[in-house]
């Protein structure tokens, strides 16, 4: 299954105390998927998209993360044939530093 797209949601954090918001989006033909956010290979959070939506926003509270952040990846899972769960490839990484540089 194709990897999801990932992005850091603005406003970007300026310190370790600020929350981090990360959006993850599956391809258009996978609405209602279950999403997992990883940090350094460890599961950080799980969210299910609404049945009519392709993605979710993970909200990580400030101070809960080791600095500097990342890399974050996300992944989604869907039920395939015979109700077996199928996992996507991992997204590209997103790194968070403080303050986050603007492009």
């Amino acid at each position: 299954i194709p990897a999801p797209s990932i992005r850091l949601v603005p406003p970007y954090p300026s310190s370790q105390e600020d929350p981090i918001h990360i959006a993850c989006m599956a391809p258009g033909n996978f609405p209602g998927a279950n999403f997992t956010l990883y940090r350094g290979g460890q599961v950080v959070q799980l969210l299910q998209a609404p049945t009519d939506q392709r993605g979710v926003t993970f909200n990580l509270s400030g101070g809960s993360s080791k600095a500097p952040g990342g890399p974050f990846h996300c992944q989604y899972g869907v039920l395939g044939e015979l109700n077996q769960s199928q996992l996507s490839d991992l997204s590209e990484p997103v790194n968070v530093s403080f303050p986050v540089p603007t492009w």
Epitope: R7, V9, P11
Partner: antibody
């Protein structure tokens, strides 16, 4: 339904400041960032910045750094954009727009700011 | 900043025509691309998000495709209410940037 209602048109003199408001309804105001985008007459869309209503964090476009201030009042579900040291080139329609995981989904009706001596 | 280049800047078409507008990003933006429609004196309205998903309430004659740097908005059969200006927008990173717009006019 989700709605963003902006304040009315303003006429300002060069050098003055303007403060535009954007009142949100139909959703949890503190759960979504608020963008500001402007559009000069006959021109395209230009992003100005974003504020997080939950904690007041902001990111501003470099072009407006030092001249723009975005604030919010969560008690009345309202975001504000103040632009100072106005010049004629700031004549534009200013829009607020809600941030969701897939971008900017709902926009205010726009506020025309005219800068003229 | 990521530059967004739309083409054409304007086009003339008739009701029933198939219309295609393209948008190119100066670097990869994955699928983080939206298309908006704007009519004179009105705010932009979201048509397509995530490059290919139809926003709720938008007619199915609108479709979007692409990923990475090249994207397309297609109107399969142009209707009178579709004459407007269309903008692409990237939102993978700030500053969020828009294409310069494509004005669809009546031939």
């Amino acid at each position: 339904q989700v709605q963003l209602v902006q304040s009315g048109a303003e006429v300002k003199k060069p050098g003055a400041s303007v403060k535009v408001s954007c009142k949100a309804s139909g959703y949890t105001f503190s759960g979504y960032g608020m963008h500001w985008v402007r559009q000069a007459p006959g021109q395209g869309l230009e992003w100005m910045g974003i504020i997080s209503p939950s904690n007041g964090n902001t990111n501003y476009a470099q072009k407006f750094q030092g001249r723009v201030t975005m604030t919010r009042d969560t008690s009345i579900s309202t975001a504000y954009m103040e632009l100072s040291r106005l010049r004629s080139e700031d004549t534009a329609v200013y829009y607020c727009a809600r941030e969701v995981y897939y971008g900017l989904d709902v926009w205010g009706q726009g506020t025309l700011v005219t800068v003229s001596s | 900043d990521i530059q967004m280049t739309q083409s054409p800047s304007s086009l003339s078409a008739s009701v029933g025509d198939r219309v295609t507008i393209t948008c190119r990003a100066s670097q990869s933006i994955s699928s983080w691309l939206n298309w908006y429609q704007q009519k004179p004196g009105k705010a932009p309205q979201l048509l397509i998000y995530g490059a290919s998903s139809l926003q709720s309430g938008v007619p199915s004659r609108f479709s979007g495709s692409g990923s990475g740097t090249d994207f397309t908005l297609t109107i399969s059969s142009l209707q009178p209410e579709d004459f407007a200006t269309y903008y692409c927008q990237q939102y993978i990173s700030i500053p969020i940037t828009f294409g310069q717009g494509t004005k669809v006019e009546i031939k």
